[in-house]
Each structure stands twice: as C-alpha cells, then as structure tokens.
C-alpha cells in the first residue's frame, strides 16, 4: 500500500517516465514506437488539462502542490516514456471522485502504456478531507506536468 | 464502444444450477467491477454481487450467499455467474453491469441486455 | 442494508410537464465528500440505463432535461420539460455500502 502522508504520495510518480530505468522484465511485451507514444500523450494532454481546471475551479482555496519538480524524465538517452502501471492505480482510486467519464479515457490510454509484468500498486484515499483534495488535486497536477515533460523531450529527440 | 455480451435464455427444472456468462469489450476489463443484478417479472431491480476481474475478489448479497458463485476470466474478457439450488422464485431477467474501478463503489454505467432464466418443473 | 424509498410509485404527465421523483435513503449515502446516489431509467422490455450519476452528474448521451440533486438522505431527480420518450420506470441506487441496493421504482 502506497502511503499517503506527506511526499511520499509522490512515489507514484518517480516511476511516472521512466521507462529506461526499468528492468527488462518489467518491459511492455510491445514497446511503443515514439509516434505512438507521442499520440497517446497528445490525446492525454487535454484531457488531463481539462479535469486539472475543473478541479481547480471546483476547489478554490486548495494551494498548488510544491512538488512540481519531480525527475519524471530519464537521463537515459533512450525514449522516455510514461509508466502506465505506476500511474493507472492512482487514477482508478479518484475516479469515483471525480469527472467519470474522463477518468475512463484516460485509463483507457494508460493501458495501453502499461508494463504487463509490473504488479500494480495498492491506492486509497486519504481519510481528512483537505488531505484528499490535495492528493487529487496533486495527481492530477504532477500527470499534467509528467505529460509536457514527455512530450518536450519527444518533440526534442529525433522524430 | 464499451459493449458487455450475455449469453442466450435458460430453462432450468427446480434444484438445478445455471451458469451465465458476460463477455466485455471495448474497455480494459481488469481494472472495472462488473456487477450482476436480477429482475423477476413486473418487478424491480435487486443486486446480487460483484467480482473485480483485475484480482478476482468478490462480494456477495447475503440473500444469495452459498448459491451465487462468480468468476473472471480474463484471457476472454468474460465474467461467468453460477447460481445454484434454483427455485421457482429465482424465475428472472438477470444482467451483468460494468462498475467503478476502486473500493469506492460507483454506478452501473454499461449493462449487458440480459438473460432470461425460467425455473419451471 | 441501506433501505431505500422512492415517491410516488407511479405518475401520470404531459408532455412539457416538469416531474419531480424523490428517494430517500434509510441512512446517508455520502462519503468522500459525495453522495453515491444514482438514477436509472428502464423503458418496457428494455436494459436500465444510467441517467444521473453521484446525485447531479450527468451521465454522457443523456439529455439536459435531466437532472439530479439531493445529498444524504434525500435525493431528487427532476425532468424539467417531459418528453414521450421519457415514459418509463425510473430506479434510484445507492452504491455507498454493500449491499447495493434500489428503490422500488417509480
């Protein structure tokens, strides 16, 4: 079970690009070429933007998370790329919190992301209600922010 | 499109079992609930349990308890309801529904189009 | 098991009317900050269909007409200008504690 209380909720997303720093057991069963990752992540991107401003605009007051610079790149030069089975448990735990049907698609891309070998983590909400609109608020955050890093570094590196 | 296939209508003789399927498609089916809810005629609707396909965990409704068995199996997408001991009153359209995804209960989203079983000597 | 009671049990309306169908829970269905209430119409011979979702959202494809409010214990699914095609058994169902449980229909 992944801990909630203080950083630490931001375990998730020390894996959230880091294809290359994973074992080759760990590996998809069907690597994705950088076009294919490109795209999933341009069908993301506003769909993550999206929820991030609703949320936002829902719960005014709620500070920004401070944890915006997370290494959610590799240094590898290989491509860097976005671990869906790091990230998918967090997105299935606010879902019933949240914009359902957004929720759905982006899963729905995540999956196709995923490390078929990599047992999923264990999510749940914190308890304290200010807590659990800052995980939320955070996840959605640190994904918006994880996706523009891929997609800087993809549109940098060769085509 | 997210679709949820059931299998065709069953007669079945009092005390006999019935095994229903409900094939998935369109969505990542480890990571949804699917529910399975019946309709006796002119009737409403009443839940009878859930499995989640990602670890096959399930919970049943007491009323069906020691009768009600699911299963998942996630090479074809398909959830599978056995009910056993039938009995007249257990005459009923009966439906598989997609969930939510966590501990969090959510609304049935995705129903399949049912399956009529008759329980008649 | 969380009881749950819909009204009135059957109606009659025009079309352009606006209908009110109320449930309310034996205990609140709220948690998270929200309330795991949710609407379903089932037309004669036909599949129930998801309409409101957590007491007013709006499910995707439904139309604007429909609308949910209500937190707790008392819920409310309003159609604000009825149209035949909305002629139908409408279920209310609550989804936060096991056993899932509906009213009886409206």
């Known amino acids: 079970m992944l801990s909630h209380a203080g950083p630490a909720r931001f375990a998730l997303f020390l894996l959230c690009c880091m294809e290359t720093l994973l074992p080759s057991h760990m590996a998809p069963t069907h690597r994705l070429q950088p076009s294919d990752v490109r795209k999933i992540i341009l069908e993301l991107r506003p769909m993550s933007k999206g929820l991030l401003q609703d949320y936002v605009s829902k719960e005014i007051g709620l500070p920004e998370s401070n944890h915006s610079s997370l290494p959610c790149l590799s240094s590898d030069s290989q491509l860097p790329h976005i671990n869906g089975s790091a990230i998918l448990p967090y997105f299935r735990a606010i879902r019933p919190l949240s914009d359902k049907n957004t929720i759905d698609k982006i899963i729905e891309q995540l999956d196709k992301l995923k490390f078929q070998r990599e047992p999923e983590a264990e999510v749940s909400m914190p308890a304290d209600n200010f807590e659990r609109k800052n995980f939320i608020l955070a996840v959605l955050q640190q994904f918006s922010a994880c996706l523009e890093h891929v997609l800087q570094s993809l549109n940098s590196g060769p085509q | 499109q997210v679709l949820l296939v059931q299998s065709g209508a069953e007669v079945k003789k009092p005390g006999a079992s019935v095994k229903i399927f409900c094939k998935a498609s369109?969505?990542?089916?480890?990571?949804?609930?699917i529910n399975w809810l019946r309709q006796a005629p002119e009737q409403g609707l009443e839940w009878m349990g859930w499995?989640?396909?990602?670890?096959?965990?399930?919970k049943y409704n007491e009323t069906f308890k020691g009768r009600l068995t699911l299963t998942a199996d996630t090479s074809t997408n398909t959830v599978y309801m056995e009910l056993s001991s039938l009995r007249s009153a257990d005459t009923a359209m009966y439906y598989c529904?997609?969930?939510?995804?966590?501990?969090?209960?959510?609304?049935?989203?995705?129903w399949g189009q049912g399956a009529l079983v008759t329980v008649s000597s | 098991e969380i009881q749950m009671t819909q009204s009135p049990s059957s109606l009659s309306a025009s079309p352009g009317d606006r209908v009110t169908i109320t449930c309310r829970a034996s205990e609140s269905v709220d948690n998270y900050g929200i309330s795991f209430m949710h609407w379903y119409q089932q037309k004669p011979g036909k599949v129930p269909k998801l309409l409101i979702y957590r007491a007013s959202n709006l499910e995707s494809g439904v139309p604007s007409r429909f609308s949910g409010s209500g937190s707790g214990t008392d819920f409310t699914l309003t159609i604000s200008s009825l149209e035949p095609e909305d002629a139908a058994t409408y279920y209310c169902?609550?989804?936060?504690?096991?056993?899932?449980?509906f009213g009886q229909g409206t």
């Open positions: 499995i989640f396909p990602g670890d096959g965990g399930t």
């Open positions: 369109g969505y990542s089916f480890t990571y949804y609930d």
């Open positions: 529904a997609r969930g939510g995804t966590s501990v969090i209960r959510d609304a049935m989203d995705y």
């Open positions: 169902q609550q989804s936060n504690k096991d056993p899932l449980t």
